[in-house]
């Protein structure tokens, strides 16, 4: 069961999102708690995801996420990534919150999550160019898999924003 426009329940914070979609959480009888994502965002586990249809540079994409009180996607698990893949369009590429600001192949997540080489999903022979310092999720027809590719940060791409669920 979903409930929208419950913002009056949370008076302590001015929110950017005017409409939330919420599900009731299992709590002790005397408490009521809602787990919410902004309308038109996707819900998975403890996070909410916004998949853009507009293209922008990596930096502008991160700013757009920040304006929505979110950040570019940080991939923590295989399951999370698979969920995202299932909601993307094969013909597009999507910026995520992984970059190499100095071009030294020192990859950094936007939320400071440590970069773990053993939990990466690069396409074959990627990353390929130190001048390509930002990462997209894209689909390769051969061998028919989603994965990561390093690209020019200025080239406009779609993006995926992520935020923690809002609890009311």
């Amino acid at each position: 069961q979903k409930y929208s426009q419950l913002l009056e329940k949370k008076t302590t914070k001015e929110l950017v999102h005017t409409t939330l979609e919420c599900v009731k959480k299992n709590m002790p009888v005397e408490e009521t708690a809602w787990s919410c994502c902004p309308k038109n965002w996707k819900s998975f586990s403890s996070n909410c995801y916004f998949i853009s249809t507009e293209s922008a540079s990596w930096q502008d994409s991160e700013k757009d996420c920040a304006r929505m009180e979110a950040h570019l996607l940080v991939i923590n698990t295989q399951e999370e990534q698979d969920f995202i893949f299932q909601n993307l369009q094969e013909e597009s590429a999507y910026f995520v919150g992984l970059s190499d600001p100095e071009g030294q192949r020192h990859w950094q997540w936007v939320d400071q999550t440590p970069y773990n080489e053993s939990s990466t999903f690069w396409h074959p022979r990627e990353p390929s160019d130190p001048n390509e310092r930002c990462v997209v999720l894209n689909f390769r027809k051969s061998p028919k898999r989603w994965g990561w590719n390093d690209v020019n940060c200025l080239g406009p791409q779609r993006s995926v924003c992520e935020m923690m669920k809002i609890h009311l």
Epitope: K141, P143, K144
Partner: antibody, heavy 125, light 111 residues
Framework: QVTLKESGPGILQPSQTLSLTCSFS??????????VSWIRQPSGKGLEWLAH???????RYNPSLKSRLTIFKDPSSNQVFLRITSVDTADTATYYC?????????????????WGAGTTVTVSS | NIVLTQSPTSFTVSLGQRATISCRAS??????????MHWYQQKPGQPPKLLIY???NVESGVPARFSGSGSRTDFTLTIDPVEADDAATYYC?????????FGGGTKLEIK
């Protein structure tokens, strides 16, 4: 239970077209992630992957034989077909079809988990 | 094309001993967080049978004496201890990239 069974002409002459059929049961080739490959093995030699067809009708071919190969499917009758044109004695082999589960959207998959028993094809004048 | 080179091409192992088969790829088959290398067993007159997938995962129903290891370009199939029923030809296969390719095979004989 997943099974696959190959059928073919047994013997044919050089320059003819080889038509092979793979009849399968226990899975649907309309299901996202499913695929079927053809693989051949000349007597006493190794395995050679020929072609693959995915659930969405996407196709892949071995580049060394691509101009001679055509793979297609009929999901309603649970069959996959392979045509090889202009056959030569070098095409004499046992031909296998095998299922390949490639979970769509995920990074896993792609191995041949179930194989048919194979059909022997001899090209001889 | 990624070329897979198996060694040895054939060898004999005593019953109860360890057998090790190597497969070397001409380039890395590690991508998407996985090593896309698989191992098959083939006995005369039979189709190949999947033993190991994604380098180290043992297929359901395969005895625990079979194991796989390795990453990127160098992979190993180990049978320990070898049983009489393990006499067969073993093939590695990659599907990291199209076209999918097989190794040339390793024939294992038991004495």
């Amino acid at each position: 239970q997943v099974t696959l069974k190959e059928s073919g002409p047994g013997i044919l002459q050089p320059s003819q077209t080889l038509s092979l059929t793979c009849s399968f049961s226990g899975f649907s080739l309309s299901t996202s992630g499913m695929g079927v490959s053809w693989i051949r093995q000349p007597s006493g030699k190794g395995l050679e992957w020929l072609a693959h067809i995915y659930w969405d009708d996407d196709k892949r071919y071995n580049p060394s034989l691509k101009s001679r190969l055509t793979i297609f499917k009929d999901p309603s009758s649970n069959q996959v077909f392979l045509r090889i044109t202009s056959v030569d004695t070098a095409d004499t082999a046992t031909y296998y079809c095998a299922r390949n589960s490639h979970y769509y959207g995920s990074t896993y998959g792609g191995y041949f988990d179930v194989w048919g028993a194979g059909t022997t094809v001899t090209v001889s004048s | 094309n990624i070329v897979l080179t198996q060694s040895p091409t054939s060898f004999t192992v005593s019953l109860g001993q360890r057998a090790t088969i190597s497969c070397r790829a001409s380039e890395s088959v590690h991508s998407y967080g996985n090593s896309f290398m698989h191992w098959y067993q083939q006995k005369p007159g039979q189709p190949p049978k999947l033993l190991i997938y994604l380098a180290s995962n043992v297929e359901s129903g395969v005895p625990a004496r079979f194991s796989g290891s390795g990453s990127r370009t160098d992979f190993t199939l180990t049978i320990d201890p070898v049983e009489a029923d393990d006499a067969a030809t073993y093939y590695c296969q990659q599907n990291s990239e199209d076209p999918w390719t097989f190794g040339g095979g390793t024939k294992l004989e038991i004495k």
